[in-house]
């Protein structure tokens, strides 16, 4: 059993490293932006220039094309749970220090927890998404 | 209140067979995934089992797989571990716990706990 | 012997502030939730900590739990004589699909 651990391990490991998950990281920020966009930005508030551009292309298509490519990505994560959890925990982890405050993080960890049932995959199961801005040791 | 009690606990041979009943009460048992944890004497606490919901899944501890059978009755409240081919590293206090593990994102953690009933297996 | 790794015991005088540390692998902590158990005397365990940090109701404050990567940690403050227990850490481990508890802490409150 050990040895399977280690060559578990080492397969999701260059699973990991292969893999690309920006455009999910992406799919992800357009996704609460547009939702800061419709639900919680004050009209009035001088916060924002509507005219700045945006670090993430807001417009649907865009996000739609980023979702398509990130759920490519988590299917190869599929038959092998452990290392989907590590996927979505690195996505977390990546973005974490670009999330303003805790309202946008709780939002961004929502929908991450749909990523998977977005892309038509299983969930991880008790997959611990708490992840510190410190981030995390790597086994 | 919540209350989970044990029941069948007994002296038995090596290579012999028990069933542990757990009648639960208090709460709607077939909304919990339900766990046995059991603790040899002077020792620390080993989980057994898991059992979901609705029973379609089952996890064991590896030196029990095949010799133990978890299983339940969600519409008289009951959880059930049958143990066969019973050995001396078997004996210990069994405990009946509610899980409180719902969805993916959360984890197992057994937040009520039956008074436990002992099995002892000895010739 | 366990996988999850505890000091085995543990004192401190009343009043003070103890942690107990919980460690593991990627596989179990670094990957899942970690719950804490108190055990008193010729008594069932009770539940303390689940999900890393939260505390069920009627559990005082005094008690907390963290975790970073691996290694999880359960913090009492205040100590009491009546916390004198065994505590266990537990947590699921992907790769054995099992639930794993740590060895135990005694607590001594001298």
């Known amino acids: 059993r050990q040895q399977w651990e280690l060559q578990g391990d080492r397969r999701c490991q260059s699973q990991l490293e292969r893999a690309n998950l920006r455009p999910c990281e992406q799919h992800l920020m357009q996704k609460i932006q547009r939702d800061e966009d419709s639900y919680g930005r004050d009209p009035y508030s001088p916060s924002q220039d509507p005219y700045s551009p945006s670090p993430y292309d807001r417009r649907g298509a865009g996000s739609s094309q980023h979702q398509e490519r990130c759920c490519n990505e988590l299917n190869e994560f599929e038959n092998n749970q452990r290392c989907m959890c590590e996927a979505l925990q690195q996505i977390m982890e990546n973005q974490s220090d670009r999330l303003q405050g805790r309202q946008q993080e709780q939002q961004f960890k929502r929908e991450l927890r749909n990523l998977p049932q977005q892309c038509g995959l299983r969930a991880p199961q008790r997959c611990d998404l708490e992840v510190e801005s410190g981030g995390r040791d790597r086994y | 209140e919540v209350q989970l009690v044990e029941s069948g606990g007994a002296l038995v041979q090596p290579g012999g067979s028990l069933r542990l009943s757990c009648a639960a009460s208090?709460?709607?048992?077939?909304?919990?995934?339900m766990t046995w944890i059991r603790q040899a004497p002077g020792k620390g606490l080993e989980w057994v089992a898991n059992i979901k919901q609705d029973g379609s899944e089952k996890d064991y501890l590896d030196s029990v797989r095949g010799r133990f059978n978890i299983s339940r009755d969600n519409a008289k409240s009951v959880l059930y571990l049958q143990m066969n081919t019973l050995s001396a590293d078997d004996t210990g206090v069994y405990y009946c716990t509610r899980n409180g593990l719902q969805d993916s994102y959360s984890g197992d953690f057994f937040d009520h706990w039956g008074q436990g009933i002992l099995v002892t297996v000895s010739s | 012997q366990s996988v999850l790794t505890q000091p085995p015991s543990i004192s401190a005088a009343p009043g003070q502030k103890v942690t107990i540390s919980c460690s593991g692998t990627g596989s179990n902590i670094g990957h899942n939730y970690v719950s804490w158990y108190q055990q008193l005397p010729r008594t069932a365990p009770r539940l303390l900590i689940f999900?890393?940090?939260k505390r069920p109701s009627g559990i005082p404050d005094r008690f907390s739990g963290s975790k970073s990567g691996s290694s999880a940690t359960l913090g009492i403050t205040g100590l009491q004589t009546g916390d004198e227990a065994h505590y266990f850490c537990?947590?699921?481990?992907?790769?054995?699909?099992?639930?794993?508890f740590g060895g135990g802490t005694k607590l001594t409150v001298l």
């Open positions: 537990a947590t699921w481990d992907a790769d054995l699909s099992a639930v794993l």
């Open positions: 208090g709460f709607k048992f077939s909304t919990f995934y």
């Open positions: 999900d890393n940090t």
